[in-house]
Interface confidence: low
């Protein structure tokens, strides 16, 4: 036997109190799939969260963060304070990147400069708190009579890269 509730579309719920009639979701609730026996409460974007997309009868509200903050977690479950480039957020607030590290975004962690020597290259441009080092050609490429130097590859250790 077919479940009578399977006929209830998204935006409704199967109301057992009304002989399994499809009732519209009440205000501030939604059902994103058919055949639901209840509607889910809409997410409310409060405080540091702001509404990116209003709740509808078929889809939940979506939040993002107010200026000066950025989203973290699946579906922007948290808002984290922005820092300046060259800083990272610690428990005590925004702190400058330590020497040898950089952060070129307003969020995320300071990350180590690329170690050019691992790729047999030399440092072409020194790193700063805000920027990674730029690796130049390998010393062999600079020897007399070497063919024209190709532009340096963009450089940093891959993985956990600058945001």
């Amino acid at each position: 036997l077919q479940d009578p509730c399977s006929n209830c579309p998204a935006g409704t719920f199967c109301d057992n109190n009304r002989n399994q009639i499809c009732s519209p979701c009440p205000p501030n609730s939604f059902s994103s799939a058919g055949g639901q026996r209840t509607c889910d409460i809409c997410r409310q974007c409060k405080g540091v969260f702001r509404t990116r997309k209003e709740c509808s009868s078929t889809s939940n509200a979506e939040c993002d963060c107010t200026p000066g903050f950025h989203c973290l977690g699946a579906g922007c479950s948290m808002c984290e304070q922005d820092c300046k480039q060259g800083q990272e957020l610690t428990k005590k607030g925004c702190k400058d990147c330590c020497f040898g590290t950089f952060n070129d975004q307003k969020r995320g962690i300071c990350r180590p400069w690329t170690n050019c020597s691992l790729d047999g290259k030399s440092v072409l441009v020194n790193g700063t708190k805000e920027r990674d080092v730029v690796c130049g050609p390998s010393p062999a490429d600079l020897s007399p009579g070497a063919s024209s130097v190709t532009p340096p590859a963009p450089a940093r250790e891959p993985g956990h890269s600058p945001q």
């Epitope: 950025h70 973290l72 990147c97 330590c98 040898g100 590290t101 070129d104 975004q105 969020r107 995320g108 962690i109 300071c110 180590p112 170690n115 691992l118 590859a153 963009p154 250790e157 891959p158 993985g159 956990h160 890269s161 600058p162 945001q163």
Partner: antibody, heavy 118, light 111 residues
Framework: QVQLVQSGAEVKKPGASVKVSCKAS????????MHWVRQAPGQRPEWMGW????????KYSQEFQDRVTITRDTSASTAYMELSSLRSEDMAVYYC???????????WGQGTMVTVSS | DIVMTQSPLSLPVTPGEPASISCRSS???????????LDWYLQKPGQSPQLLIF???NRASGVPDRFSGSGSGTDFTLKISRVEAEDVGVYYC????????FGQGTRLEIK
Amino acid sequence: QVQLVQSGAEVKKPGASVKVSCKASGYTLTNYPMHWVRQAPGQRPEWMGWSNAGNGNTKYSQEFQDRVTITRDTSASTAYMELSSLRSEDMAVYYCTREGVTGGFDIWGQGTMVTVSS
Amino acid sequence: DIVMTQSPLSLPVTPGEPASISCRSSQSLLHSIGYNYLDWYLQKPGQSPQLLIFLGSNRASGVPDRFSGSGSGTDFTLKISRVEAEDVGVYYCMQALQTVTFGQGTRLEIK
């Protein structure tokens, strides 16, 4: 929701090239680095290269340096990985994966199977 | 490249029991800024890998608290306090201090 959707499976002849696409949705492509990882059947994953978030600069694993090109089309929110001079050892599932704000590959595409056969 | 070595390679576990996977790197993954550049991933059968733990000990969003990561330098451990049937798959450690490399994987199966 945040997701990466990759192009479908490919069958290529040895010596040919393959270009895999990876469409980002639910977030802004230029806010996060994009990496490419491949996995041959029964093997551990192998990192191929990445594209920097802001400026799209790329860096490749030494092993693929001469054969791989990573690009992106920000207007289409899509990243691409092209591998040339294919050989039988390149038969693998190729993944795009986003690097999260504090590191770690937090979102992965579903993978694209590339078969190399004459 | 940094070589990552996992043990055991196969791990049969009874549901509800704890499980532990070891990962050793050929050189220290602890950077002077205090981060261990090591992540843990789970690849369930027929699926893409999923992030469990980043920077050595931080649980990723949505990961149950039965998963925990510990260790520093060259020796790291992933612990599952009570294994559930859905935890079946291959667990990989991955270092990202230098060119990214993965461990060979540990296959967790239910006894």
